[in-house]
Amino acid sequence: IWELKKDVYVVELDWYPDAPGEMVVLTCDTPEEDGITWTLDQSSEVLGSGKTLTIQVKEFGDAGQYTCHKGGEVLSHSLLLLHKKEDGIWSTDILKDQKEPKNKTFLRCEAKNYSGRFTCWWLTTISTDLTFSVKSSRGSSDPQGVTCGAATLSAERVRGDNKEYEYSVECQEDSACPAAEESLPIEVMVDAVHKLKYENYTSSFFIRDIIKPDPPKNLQLKPLKNSRQVEVSWEYPDTWSTPHSYFSLTFCVQVQGKSKREKKDRVFTDKTSATVICRKNASISVRAQDRYYSSSWSEWASVPCS
Amino acid sequence: VPGGSSPAWTQCQQLSQKLCTLAWSAHPLVGHMDLREEGDEETTNDVPHIQCGDGCDPQGLRDNSQFCLQRIHQGLIFYEKLLGSDIFTGEPSLLPDSPVGQLHASLLGLSQLLQPEGHHWETQQIPSLSPSQPWQRLLLRFKILRSLQAFVAVAARVFAHGAATLSP
């Protein structure tokens, strides 16, 4: 058993049929010594008396808010949550496996630049009685500070018969050094509580590996005289790190016909313009990637050829 | 470059960008085998990193690029030695089309551009690499190349910025 926060405790349980459970001793936070009784949740049934209460925690029915009273007055509370371990593996019932980039990916994170700011998100099908708490640091043995905001519900989607809820959080490294080569990864830890179930999820990454630039901005076409060719130009996204002579991007320019089956013409360039042939009813798209480190491509910025 | 002269920024930029490309193309091609149950050997923690105080940020380069260039040189020599060690020359043999050989040669090429014959910087003492167990090598190659990708990315940014802003 360990303390999650004031008056909230997590009991770690090996979860298998007829498991003995964990013996837990609760102590009433009071100077009083006698006349103390204990109840669980809303029930008025007295579970025991005395300053301490010893219980055997085996299942969710044994978890909940234990309250000690004296003469009708509440003295203190202890909320017990359960953290299940099945076959040596902690349960992951609350969050959905996003399976990208690999199985057992519950948290996904992205950064738009090297400033030390990043966003993480996760999915669940649970709509109520759900709370999240997020902590982060750089490194684990001698952690350096990363400040995270509160997790918020950022999207709702319908997936078949189920509703899926996306939560996200923004974090900022306290003393970021954008030009340095990271040697210690960022660690993100999410505590999830659904009713009386506690779970924790972690992710470890380098900012360089989660970089995904915003799409190029101000995408424009300039037809070239007496030619089917056009000059496409664009600019670095505002959110990208500066100076651009140091934090450089590379670009992919794509000409795509109306039909998905039509052959795509692609050009790769380090410049912020390119000359391509514009076909009727086609569109021109440009996306960006860090020039020197193969992290994610941005989403496409597109304009119609016409 | 030792002694304060400027490097051939444009040549360094071109070669460092080539290094980035090679480091990424070498990464999946480190051997004929799956990683399977290879142990998570922490053997690449000793590689030199370009850290915050090394002057490799735009402001630091403007103030005095020598600190940063020396750091990059140390790293290039270190990785060149690693790529020549039995981690890469031992079995499992590299795939026939593995660019590790080219990568190795390019590391040496860039380090020589930074330190021409007859000039000498203090080079960090390269730890003598003890022979690696064959079963560890695939994982070690994977980790070394991942680490090298990060190192050469910073070096390439430095040379690109130098070529754009510090070239005579």
Epitope: - | H32, M33, R36, E37, K81, G84, S85, D86, T89, G90, E91, P92, S93, G101, S128, L129, S130, P131, Q133, P134, W135
Partner: antibody, heavy 115, light 107 residues
Framework: EVQLQQSGPELVKPGASVKMSCKAS????????IHWVKQRPGQGLEWIGY????????KYNEKFKGKATLTSDKSSSTAYMELSSLTSEDSAVYYC????????WGQGTLVTVSA | DIVMTQSPATLSVTPGDRVSLSCRAS??????LHWYQQKSPESPRLLIK???QSISGIPSRFSGSGSGSDFTLSINSVEPEDVGVYYC?????????FGSGTKLEIK
């Protein structure tokens, strides 16, 4: 074509030393380790050790430490093995091989130790 | 040291037979096992690497299987030129060790 050409047979006296060579061709000498293997007449194979010609790092079978010394010369793309304090137990064919998972072995050097 | 045990010591077969040669390691070596053929007075020749990977130029009748500590070299239709001694080798960790060999004879 990759080839490992070993030096010719040696007849040596007990207590003496012998140095044999393995000349590599058809590939970059420093790109691959060279193993040395012993085979006594009518017997199996025993690994002696290897050398990495790039940095001259060696690894020996404990059994052959003090008996075998592996060296290499980059300029001639040649690996060497010296055997010291020879006894009749050292009479054998000695092979050099480039990495186990590649089918490149020298033809062997026969060493006969006899008074 | 990892001990490699081969069985049988000698195998007498008729051309066209399918044969299996066994090799057991004293501890797990994953798939780091190589098979060699040696005909007197030649150098050993690599037949199979990493337990089951084929080698170019080696006839397809030779195949390997196994992982951990039990390995098999199979020759699915023996030819007269397959006579010789077959060695398995631990390529997993130092010191590299070879089995004592299986001698293949033609009846």
């Amino acid at each position: 074509e990759v080839q490992l050409q070993q030096s010719g047979p040696e007849l040596v006296k007990p207590g003496a030393s012998v140095k044999m060579s393995c000349k590599a061709s058809g590939y970059t000498f420093t790109s691959s380790i060279i193993h040395w293997v012993k085979q006594r007449p009518g017997q199996g194979l025993e690994w002696i050790g290897y050398i990495n010609p790039y940095d001259d790092v060696t690894k020996y079978n404990e059994k052959f430490k003090g008996k075998a010394t592996l060296t290499s010369d980059k300029s001639s793309s040649t690996a060497y093995m010296e055997l010291s304090s020879l006894t009749s137990e050292d009479s054998a064919v000695y092979y050099c091989a480039r990495r186990w998972d590649e089918s490149y072995w020298g033809q062997g050097t026969l060493v006969t130790v006899s008074a | 040291d990892i001990v490699m045990t081969q069985s049988p010591a000698t195998l007498s077969v008729t051309p066209g037979d399918r044969v299996s040669l066994s090799c057991r390691a004293s501890q797990s070596i994953s798939v780091y096992l190589h098979w060699y053929q040696q005909k007197s007075p030649e150098s050993p020749r690599l037949l199979i690497k990493y337990a089951s990977q084929s080698i170019s130029g080696i006839p397809s009748r030779f195949s390997g299987s196994g992982s951990g500590s039990d390995f098999t070299l199979s020759i699915n239709s023996v030819e007269p030129e397959d006579v010789g001694v077959y060695y398995c080798q631990n390529g997993h960790s130092f010191p590299f060790t070879f089995g004592s060999g299986t001698k293949l004879e033609i009846k």
